[in-house]
């Protein structure tokens, strides 16, 4: 019963997910993962926030909205056909079995036309981000499945940015939203 969202190859995909913090700055941990939401966590985690900040993400996955106000919608940059599938947004509300989870289905269509880019911007410069990841001991093994390779410098066209901002506005009302508190 997942909601379906569409994007074309080469575009940025937008998967909406929202919650209303109980009080300003009173954030709830959120994770995004590839695959349907399991009983705990988010399958293969691609991005997560804690009570303060985005504390883990992988290349091409980022939050473009104001997550401090509960907009935890996921943007996937420069999608390929391999990005098709179900994604999990999980709002990790503290307590006994309080998590809210949403399955969103992303359908990637082949690009109709490949426009010649007129101007390029470095997303790392345009959207600087702090990254804090949790360390594992040397004997740890985590299988992350078919996650994309990390490429810290992500390039996208200005046209994509503009299109995505319009798409985000169009989809915002249809996104998964919960109120906390």
């Amino acid at each position: 019963s997942e909601v379906e969202y569409r994007a074309e190859v080469g575009q940025n995909a937008y998967l909406p997910c929202f919650y209303t913090p109980a009080a300003p700055g009173n954030l709830v941990p959120v994770c995004w993962g590839k695959g349907a939401c399991p009983v705990f966590e988010c399958g293969n985690v691609v991005l997560r926030t804690d009570e303060r900040d985005v504390n883990y993400w992988t290349s091409r996955y980022w939050l473009n909205g104001d997550f401090r106000k509960g907009d935890v919608s996921l943007t996937i940059e420069n999608v390929t056909l391999a990005d098709s599938g179900i994604y999990c947004c999980r709002i990790q509300i503290p307590g006994i079995m309080n998590d809210e989870k949403f399955n969103l289905k992303l359908v990637i269509k082949p690009a109709k036309v490949t426009p010649a880019p007129t101007r390029q911007r470095d997303f790392t410069a345009a959207f600087p981000r702090m990254l804090t990841t949790r360390g594992h001991g040397p004997a740890e093994t985590q299988t992350l499945g078919s996650l994309p390779d990390i490429n810290l410098t992500q390039i996208s066209t200005l046209a994509n940015e503009l299109r995505d901002s319009r798409l985000a506005n169009d989809l915002r009302d249809s996104g998964a939203t919960i109120r906390i508190g």
Partner: antibody
């Protein structure tokens, strides 16, 4: 080497209480969900409860959540199960198990303790 | 609750045989399925997670397959140490649930 060692089991009368402990070593304890699973004599496996990394979220078998409480102390690398109002049907070997990690991916109880026997009888 | 039904409940086989145990979920659990082996008086041991990924240290004669509601555990050539009980378990819905078990005995 990952090691989980349960303790605290024993004989208790119906209506009594017990607190089980599980000492973890060989991995970064705070990076994993942890679980309790039980097995009645001659029976199959039954999930009891799970707890997230910092203890802020807990998950229970519905029929047990009013009597059992799972908790953890990351500073001590320890997992606990407080069992109250015990019944004869709670008699089982209780296992501590390591569940999914911080980055997801591995959905299965990868490591188990040796188990501790809880016997509820008058 | 998601019910997990294993079949057969018991099975007699000989060393060298190929054995398949099946597990059916009452609802779609995608690939969130694990298989465990348990010997008498011992703790369970993870064999397969995410339906088909072999756990660390598990011999390659074990394999898992399936997704959605139907899953199988296959032992390609039974060894003497494989005679034990086997359980499937889903990690998709709460509560987590196990199959009732399959006891694999020597013929």
């Amino acid at each position: 080497e990952v090691k989980l060692v349960e303790s605290g089991g024993g004989l208790v009368q119906p209506g009594g209480s017990l607190r089980l402990s599980c000492a973890a070593s060989g991995f970064t304890f705070s990076d994993y969900y942890m679980a309790w699973v039980r097995q009645a004599p001659g029976k199959g496996l039954e999930w009891v409860a799970n707890i997230n990394y910092d203890g802020s979220s807990t998950y229970y078998l519905d029929s047990l959540k009013s009597r059992f409480t799972i908790s953890r102390d990351n500073a001590k690398n320890s997992l606990y199960l407080q069992m109250n109002s015990l019944k004869a049907e709670d008699t089982a070997v209780y296992y501590c198990a390591r569940d999914v990690g911080y980055y997801g991916g591995n959905y299965g109880f990868a490591y188990w303790g040796q188990g501790t026997l809880v016997t509820v009888s008058s | 609750d998601i019910q997990m039904t294993q079949s057969p409940s018991s099975l007699s086989a000989s060393v060298g045989d190929r054995v398949t145990i099946t597990c059916r979920a009452s609802d779609n659990i995608y690939s969130y399925l694990a298989w465990y082996q348990q010997k008498p008086g011992k703790s369970p041991q993870l064999l397969v997670y995410n339906a088909k990924t072999l756990a660390e240290g598990v011999p390659s004669r074990f394999s898992g397959s399936g997704s959605g509601t139907d899953f199988t555990l296959t032992i390609s050539s039974l060894q003497p140490e494989d005679f034990a009980s086997y359980y499937c378990q889903q990690h998709y819905g709460s509560p987590l649930t196990f199959g009732q078990g399959t006891k694999l005995e020597i013929k």
